[in-house]
């Protein structure tokens, strides 16, 4: 009997994720099963499904499959976090490149090489043809997308909408052309999933046909996603285990990027006089091992043969015979010139003393290995081994214990805002350390901010100038009071937490503040029935430069018809330009007879570049900022609404996408407002809510 192929390798996995259909017309099919592999086989074969299966979710708790005719890129669908779910999306539907002749290509390109729009497959105008979707089941002849149903030489093609041109190939690149790597590909995180001889790679989270030690949960920083080629062990280039039982592993054909420079977040800090961490960034000229025996040249095979050559290990600076650490050993080393001693460590190179020169980190600091052990507020860090239980509570993989030594500042959870540590203080369980990013390090902590890749759906005293009064459902709006006067706005994001701005706190005495919820009138007139007045028990300051504050309430707010929470966006998401948004506030409105009612001003999202132009180039926006312009001249936030939200709606869901902060002008005609981008700080907010204790109601 022919063994059924295991098709799960054809899917991209997103752990702890499910898809929610917003459009009720979309169908789904469910069934109890034992494994995700069973779901995958049925999805691939479309057996018993009334639609073409593009993705499925495996519910680990209920042992259930949910098959979908859509994926996360489809409209009418949103991604949602859920511990018990794993989302698997058929790669063919999300790939934007072809493998071989592109027979399996199921992407959405619908324009030919010369730029002509494709004719729909189900249409006979302008060209009659026999390529009907019903005749080519499984070939996905949908809409007018480029396809290669017969696997012909030129790759995917289509009939064109131009009566003069019957058909033409489409310009879809080979995946091997799209994918590229720097150096020897240790930082490669691309989507190549087959070897240079065309064998399909085995999933890293599977042990068949080949058993191996590279388990994704054991090596969370190695990028062991799905069955993509990786270089976890210092090989000359990325490789993978194959699905061929007779070929354990093979290299992958990934070309070197044109600009072959290190651009990942893991670039070791280069030093010349001393060793930082394991010395992977050591670029000095020491050329003897610890006992004085000279090193062998890296480009020589005498007296020791080896493959640690400069060609195989680009970017590792294997010059001359200098001590280096190209393979992640415990410290710099070299082959020796003594035929009887193959290798030796250069342990005479001193460790960099952290007190000399400025301590700094690159990227998000996940590879920071310095000796700082104090938080930005001066608290001494507590030992990592005493806090592992807490760490496991908010990360879903096994942290690299070898990095978590003593009580040094580290970044085991891939925090976007740098190294941190636990404190031993129950009020401040953890905080960031006072370390800056290294000068000149421009690695973005979120990529592709200008491309709407991730959907956002799952926002002082600034005043809304010329806004209109509002009494719609704005139960998340908070009036922060300082000495009994309204000082700032804020957003209730959880029963015990208000998101607001740092500038709203002139006094460090928390008794000076109150939070008013459920009000419409800034003085609370007529709101007696619905008003909740809560004291403030703690302020948690956002990452450096964010100007955000999470204000903890002394007791949780009671959610009712007048008080509600507002959702946060997904981390790193982008909201499309021209999305309609609103700012809310009780501040100065430009009216002499100000009635004290909560106002709303309608704005629309503007891209960062365009926004900078509107500010006459004087302002450069970065990934932590979001811009919105007024539809009506002179309408927008102003002094008095600081801390308040920029609220946007996506997929019928309202979210706080920005926080109003000072310093960017106020309701100036043709000058859009710049807000703190909440999506950039969403992980920090979730981490605080998860780790800080709150009083029970």
């Amino acid at each position: 009997q022919r063994k059924r192929r295991n098709t799960i390798h054809e899917f991209k996995k997103s752990a702890k994720t499910t898809l929610i259909k917003i459009d009720p017309a979309l169908k789904i099919k469910t069934k109890k099963v034992n494994t995700a592999d069973q779901c995958a086989n049925r999805c691939t074969r479309n057996k018993g499904l009334p639609f073409t299966c593009k993705a499925f979710v495996f519910d680990k708790a209920r042992k259930q499959c949910l098959w979908f005719p859509f994926n996360s890129m489809s409209s009418g669908v949103k991604k949602e976090f859920g511990h018990e779910f794993d989302l698997y999306e058929n790669k063919d539907y999300i790939r934007n490149c072809i493998i071989g002749k592109g027979r399996s290509y199921k992407g959405t390109v619908s324009i030919t090489k010369s730029g002509i729009k494709c004719q729909p497959w189900s249409s006979m105008i302008p060209h009659e043809h026999s390529f009907l979707p019903s005749s080519y089941r499984g070939k996905d002849l949908q809409e007018n997308y480029c396809r290669n149903p017969r696997g012909e030489e030129g790759g995917p093609w289509c009939f064109t909408s131009n009566p003069e041109v019957r058909y033409e190939v489409c310009d879809i690149p080979q995946c091997s052309e799209v994918e590229c790597m720097t150096c020897n590909g240790e930082s490669y995180r691309g989507l190549m999933d087959h070897t240079e001889s065309g064998k399909i790679c085995q999933r890293w989270d599977h042990q068949t046909p080949h058993r191996h030690k590279f388990l994704p949960e054991r090596y969370p920083d190695k990028g062991f996603d799905d069955n993509y080629c990786r270089n976890p062990d210092g090989q000359p280039r990325p490789w993978c285990y194959t699905l061929d039982p007779h070929t354990r592993w093979e290299y992958c054909a990934i070309k070197t990027c044109a600009d072959n420079t290190m651009n990942d977040t893991d670039v070791p800090l280069e030093t010349t006089e001393c060793i930082q961490g394991q010395g992977e960034g050591y670029r000095g000229t020491v050329n003897t091992i610890w006992n004085g025996i000279p090193c062998q040249r890296w480009d020589s095979q005498y007296p020791h043969e080896h493959d640690m050559t400069p060609e195989n290990f680009k970017c590792k600076d294997l010059r001359e015979n200098y001590c280096r650490n190209p393979d992640g050993s415990e410290s710099p080393w070299c082959f020796t010139t003594d035929p009887n001693i193959r290798v030796g460590y250069c342990s005479q190179i001193p460790n960099c003393d952290m007190s000399h020169g400025q301590d700094c980190y690159r990227g998000n600091g996940k590879n920071y290995m310095g000796n700082l052990s104090q938080t930005r507020s001066g608290l001494t860090c507590s030992m990592w081994d005493k806090n592992m239980e807490d760490l496991h509570r908010h990360i879903f993989w096994e942290p690299d214990a070898s990095k978590l030594n003593e009580n040094y500042c580290r970044n085991p959870d891939d925090d976007a805002h740098g190294p941190w540590c636990y404190t031993g203080n129950p009020l401040i369980p953890w905080d960031y350390c006072p370390i800056s990013r290294c000068e000149g390090d421009t690695t973005p902590t979120i990529v592709n901010l200008d491309h709407p890749v991730i959907s956002c759906a799952k926002t002082k005293q600034l005043r809304v100038v010329n806004g209109i009064p509002t009494r719609t459902n704005i139960g998340w709006m908070v009036s922060l009071r300082y000495r009994n006067k309204h000082i700032c706005g804020g957003s209730l994001i959880k029963e015990s937490w208000v998101l607001t701005a740092r500038q709203c706190f002139p006094s460090r005495d928390l008794k000076d503040y109150e939070a008013w919820l459920g009000i419409h009138d800034v003085h609370g007139r007529g709101d007696e029935k619905c008003k909740q007045v809560l004291n403030v028990s703690q302020l948690v300051y956002g990452p450096e430069g964010s100007d955000l504050v999470l204000m903890k309430l002394a007791r949780p707010a009671v959610l009712d018809d007048f008080v509600s929470t507002i959702d946060l966006p997904n981390y790193g998401c982008t909201i499309p330009e021209k999305t309609s948004c609103s700012v809310y506030g009780w501040g100065y409105t430009g009216l002499i007879n100000y009635d004290g009612l909560l106002r709303v001003a309608h704005l629309y999202i503007m891209g960062n570049e365009k926004c900078s132009q509107h500010h006459r180039g004087k302002v450069t926006l970065n990934e932590s900022e979001i811009c919105a312009g007024a539809e009506k001249i002179g309408s927008g936030p102003c002094e008095g609404d600081y801390g308040g939200p920029l609220v946007c709606e996506q997929h019928k869901m309202r979210m706080v996408l920005g926080v109003i902060v000072p310093g960017r002008g106020c309701a100036i005609p043709n000058r859009p407002g710049i807000f703190v981008r909440v999506a950039y700080y969403a992980k920090w907010i979730h981490k605080i809510i998860l780790t800080y204790k709150v009083p029970q109601s």
């Epitope: 000082i487 701005a501 740092r502 500038q503 002139p506 964010s546 600081y642």
Partner: nanobody, 122 residues
Framework: EVQLVESGGGLVQPGGSLRLSCAAS????????IGWFRQAPGNEREGVSC????????YYADSVKGRFTISRDNAKDTVYLQMNSLKPEDTAVYYC???????????????WGQGTQVTVSS
């Protein structure tokens, strides 16, 4: 009586230095974030610098970055603004006030002082 009093202004040549003081009376200064503001004739008041009571962090307007330094002496209930490399465009009345302070700027709240005149001219 609760108040803030500025001092240290004067006439100075371009490139010169001045040190302004903001002293509190009637309340403990270290509980409050203090900001320096200035207003030149015919111009709006602008925030110059602030020092936070929350964590000691500081903010400087772009126009004074690298030239001005803010500091506080809690024992003396005083905040200082050290102004170096002064330029004619720094001419203004300088005020201190209880403020909100952050990386994006500062907001004045209460307890304004009466101001001290700084004139930079050759």
């Amino acid at each position: 009586e609760v108040q803030l009093v500025e001092s240290g202004g004067g006439l100075v040549q371009p490139g010169g230095s001045l040190r302004l003081s903001c002293a509190a009376s009637g309340f403990t200064l270290d509980h409050y974030t203090i900001g320096w503001f200035r207003q030149a004739p015919g111009n709006e008041r602008e925030g110059v610098s602030c020092i936070s009571s929350l964590d000691g962090s500081t903010y400087y307007a772009d126009s004074v970055k690298g030239r001005f330094t803010i500091s506080r002496d809690n024992a003396k209930d005083t905040v200082y603004l050290q102004m170096n490399s002064l330029k004619p465009e720094d001419t203004a009345v300088y005020y201190c006030a209880v403020a909100g302070c952050g990386a994006y700027g500062l907001i004045p709240y209460d307890y304004w002082g009466q101001g001290t005149q700084v004139t930079v001219s050759s």
